[in-house]
């Protein structure tokens, strides 16, 4: 009774289609699978960025897998063939591992790459990225930004750079159709007659870097002798009301400062009849129902009331 063996996949490789970090892992079937042609062979794939402590593990019947990686670091992957126990009348049989690596040969020293890269998706409408030139680079150095997300045929270059002293220090992006809730890949590379420039790679999701506009139309409404309702409207733009959190700052008679975080466009404040002045400002942020992270908006214009009319039912600016 001979021991059942299976070969590892052939030609295991990592392919870079030019999508700035979204890579293809692909392989060919092992040879000598005819003994198992009634049986579906599976593959166990493990991969990670070099330096990461944990492997991502996938079991698949396919001959390829796609995922995003940090191209600032190398990538390592390994794969073996699995014959399920149904194929072997007993325990699962595994081949030896086939291994491969991939990295982009770095040009230039690390200090030449862009510094302090910062990207903000203003009001879920306009993406703007800015950076500082690398340390010690000359004024002839220019940086170029390329981007890709699933849905684009190929990586695109920025067409509207922000410049300072003739150097590109930022990019205003065009309208990005169907670009949220998926990885957005950026590469900023550079050129200089003086020395090679190191490329930098960035990956994020646009909904996580949204900075909304501040709320508008702040109003007061007297609810009772000791309660005032503060109200405002969601900022203009595409962000739905269900996606907002708000932070309020309330000042009574120049002394008391109340801050609160709320999910709705109202806040009820306990007051006394002695209150002579009331001011509040609000800012907004995309909440956890619509993103994993976000940036607070600027504060709204201050809305104040002072004088005896505070006891009346509605106070408008």
């Amino acid at each position: 009774d001979t021991e059942i063996k299976v070969n590892p996949p052939q030609d295991f490789e990592i392919v870079d289609p030019g999508y700035l970090g979204y890579l293809y892992l692909q392989w060919q079937p092992p040879l000598s699978l005819d003994h198992f042609k009634e049986c579906t062979v599976e593959y166990e794939l493990k991969y990670r960025n070099i330096g990461s402590e944990t492997w991502k593990t996938i079991i698949t019947k396919n001959l390829h897998y796609k995922d995003g990686f940090d191209l600032n670091k190398g990538i390592e992957a390994k794969i073996h063939t699995l014959l399920p126990w149904q194929c072997t009348n007993g325990s699962e049989v595994q081949s030896s591992w086939a291994e491969t690596t991939y990295w982009i040969s770095p040009q230039g020293i690390p200090e030449t790459k862009v510094q302090d890269m910062d990207c903000v998706y203003y009001n879920w409408q306009y993406l703007l990225c800015s950076w500082k030139p690398g340390i010690g680079v000359l004024l002839d150095t220019n940086y170029n930004l390329f981007y890709w997300y699933e849905g684009l045929d190929h990586a695109l270059q920025c067409v509207d750079y922000i410049k300072a002293d003739g150097q590109n220090i930022g990019c205003r992006f065009p309208y990005l159709e169907a670009s949220d809730y998926k990885d957005f890949y950026i590469c900023v590379n550079g050129s200089s007659e003086n020395k090679p420039i190191r490329s930098s790679y960035f990956t994020f999701q646009l909904q996580n870097i949204v900075k909304p506009l501040p709320p508008v139309y702040l109003t007061f409404t007297r609810e009772s002798s000791c309660e005032i309702k503060l109200k405002w409207s969601i900022p203009l733009g595409p962000i739905p009301a269900r996606c907002f959190d708000y932070e309020i700052e309330i000042r009574e008679d120049d002394t008391t400062l109340v801050t609160a975080t709320v999910e709705n466009e109202t806040y009820t404040l306990k007051t006394t009849n002695e209150t002579r002045q009331l001011c509040f400002v609000v800012r907004s942020k995309v909440n956890i129902y619509c993103s994993d992270d976000g940036i607070w908006s600027e504060w709204s214009d201050k809305q104040c009331w002072e004088g005896e009319d505070l006891s009346k039912k509605t106070l408008l600016r």
């Epitope: 030609d11 392919v15 040879l31 000598s32 005819d34």
Partner: antibody, heavy 118, light 107 residues
Framework: QVQLVQSGAEVVKPGASVKVSCKAS????????MSWVRQAPGQGLEWVGT????????YYPESVKGRFTITRDTSTSTAYMELRSLRSDDTAVYYC???????????WGQGTLVTVSS | DIVMTQSPLSLPVTLGQPASISCKAS??????VAWYQQRPGQSPRALIY???YRYSGVPDRFSGSGSGTDFTLKISRVEAEDVGVFYC?????????FGQGTKLEIK
Amino acid sequence: QVQLVQSGAEVVKPGASVKVSCKASGFTFSSYGMSWVRQAPGQGLEWVGTISGGGSYTYYPESVKGRFTITRDTSTSTAYMELRSLRSDDTAVYYCARRDLRSAMDYWGQGTLVTVSS
Amino acid sequence: DIVMTQSPLSLPVTLGQPASISCKASQNVDINVAWYQQRPGQSPRALIYSASYRYSGVPDRFSGSGSGTDFTLKISRVEAEDVGVFYCQQYNAYPLTFGQGTKLEIK
């Protein structure tokens, strides 16, 4: 539909070099290996090399190893075979073919005649 | 290297009659065998992979069988467009090797 379009015929002198191209369309180029097969006048088929989908692996028979080099350019979906130090017995029609998932060759180009003659 | 030996090298067949081509490998190649047809003046065309599986678009009068070292290509009813040279090929190990070809002609 899958198409492989090869470059035109070449006439070269012994010892010279030539580069034959094969432009692919109708499929995801980087997902498939490409093989090259030659056919001398009136003779059968002879495999002369294979390159994997991503270009990481190349395979050649001993008869051409060191003289023939296969490369690929994903940006233009083109495979190339460079033939160096050519001899008269390298005269043949050179075919590119897509390697299917089993290393058989499922689609073939129209062929490029390379004539080595002094 | 694995040697693939085809027989017969020439096969005259009457239209509508069956035809059979044999291919023997010098060592075990499991089912890693393909068959190709080359019509006069044309590029080869893939017919069969993994010894017995037809490529899409290949008429079902073509069938392949075998494993290990012995393989057969059968044409159930030969048609005029089947004229040409048929090659077997093993891809079990590099270097990939072809049989020397079988020329099918109409009687």
